[in-house]
């Protein structure tokens, strides 16, 4: 806190300008209005005032604005910004997406700090829903910004915002939010053609049912062995070996490497060793010939 | 990304030094630099300034007339020449850059010790 002093003779601040980084912190706080402040905001990004300087220029604003700055401010704060606290950022009013990319700028390149996560929270909870203008803006920002979110948080994206969302985007989301995705995907997509629409999907696929991968299987995709292994286990187990055989097409080899891990080798375990070694692909682990197979499930089911 | 000061060191009042800011990294072309000293105990304060485009300087009071501070873009490098010092010149002296509207990028630099004692 710096102790309120008369502004000696002639350092009355007329504009925000270079000559204020000779101001001692005391000076700044007697010297310089805030309101002026406030209208010239623009101009301290320019100045390379210290951080010690940089605290009362804050001090300052939030003197002249308790109830949280407006938006004209805001946009200006440029690296004003990194002082800012969760709590300062939870009395904001931000709109504009202009002014959601400038605050980001200004964090550009570093890890997604609290307050960037509370300015977000904020954002989007004043427009309601995550539209494609703002999802482009905060995926390109931070690519991993999706899977940041919980399912119940991703419920509120709306089918056309998918068409923002780049493979890259989803890279750290797990099973539980693309089962939340897929769906929208599916939906966002559904007008393309065969190729064009599995090029589309198939980054959101972790999140696919079992009847979607078969009816995959019909169209001569060639999914890629690192697609497949991110499908649910649940979903590939009901899947045949001429389906499988069908889904990955010329990459059907690469399951040996993979016999082993997940959703391969439940996959194995539930497929006749028959039906595996037609692959062959050297497969082991299959039901031997001449076993029952009894799905206990569809018994429990019945009784 | 970073700000790298030299040129400090040890010399007697009345005497030079040449301080130099150095940007690795980046381009310092588009960033007004501020140079910045500390005294043991004191607080920061700036000592000069020189815009993005080198056309205007300027000058805390207490070193107007002593102080020049210049830059040369195609050496990333913008320079502080320091005559007739004085013992109340002794401190860290840091550079910082800062990047002006549509670019908050700014940074700061370690610092260089001048210590001006008879």
């Known amino acids: 806190e710096v102790e309120k002093t008369a502004c000696p003779s002639g350092k009355k601040a007329r504009e925000i300008d270079e000559s204020l980084i000779f101001y001692k912190k005391w000076e700044l706080e007697a010297c310089v209005d805030a309101a002026l402040l406030a209208t010239q905001m623009d101009r301290v990004n320019a100045i390379p005032f210290t951080y010690e300087q940089l605290d009362v220029l804050k001090h300052k604003l939030d003197e002249l604005y308790p109830q949280g700055y407006p938006e004209s401010v805001i946009q200006h704060l440029g690296y004003l910004f990194l002082k800012m606290s969760p709590e300062d950022i939870r009395k904001w009013n931000v709109t504009s997406l202009e002014t959601l990319k400038a605050l980001l700028e200004v964090n550009k390149g570093h890890e997604m700090s609290p307050q960037v996560a509370t300015l977000i929270d904020r954002f989007v909870k004043g427009r309601g829903q995550l539209d494609k203008d703002t999802l482009d803006t905060l995926t390109a920002f931070y690519p991993g910004y999706l899977c940041s979110l919980s399912p119940e948080e991703l419920s509120s994206v709306p089918p056309s915002s998918i068409w923002a969302v780049r493979p890259q985007d989803l890279d750290t989301c797990d099973p539980r939010q693309l089962d939340v995705l897929y769906p929208k995907a599916r939906l966002a997509f559904q007008n393309m053609n065969g190729s064009e629409y599995f090029v589309k999907i198939q980054s959101f696929l972790g999140g696919a049912p079992t009847e979607d991968l078969k009816a995959l299987s019909q169209q001569n995709v060639s999914m890629d062995l690192a697609t497949f292994m991110k499908l649910r286990t649940d979903a590939v187990l009901p899947l045949t070996v001429a389906e499988v055989q069908k889904l990955l097409g010329p990459h059907v080899e690469g399951l040996k490497a993979e016999e082993r891990h997940r959703p391969v080798r439940d996959w194995i375990l539930r497929q006749r060793q028959d039906d595996l070694d037609t692959l062959g692909l050297g497969l082991q682990g299959g039901i031997p010939n001449g076993y029952l197979v009894l799905d206990l499930s569809m018994q429990e089911a019945l009784s | 990304l970073q700000l790298v000061e030299s040129g400090g060191g040890l010399d007697q009042p009345g005497g030079s030094l040449r301080l130099s800011c150095a940007a690795s990294g980046f381009t310092l072309d588009y960033y007004a630099i501020g140079w910045f000293r500390q005294a043991p105990g004191k607080e920061r304060e700036g000592v000069s300034y020189?815009?993005?485009?080198?056309?205007?300087?300027n000058y805390a009071d207490s070193v107007k007339g002593r102080f020049t501070i210049s830059r040369d873009n195609a050496k990333n490098t913008v320079y502080l020449q320091m005559n007739s010092l004085k013992p109340e010149d002794t401190g860290v002296y840091s550079c910082?850059?800062?990047?002006?509207?549509?670019?908050?990028?700014?940074?700061w630099g370690q610092g260089t010790s001048v210590t001006v004692s008879s």
């Open positions: 020189i815009s993005s485009s080198g056309g205007s300087t």
């Open positions: 910082a850059a800062a990047g002006g509207y549509g670019n908050s990028s700014r940074y």
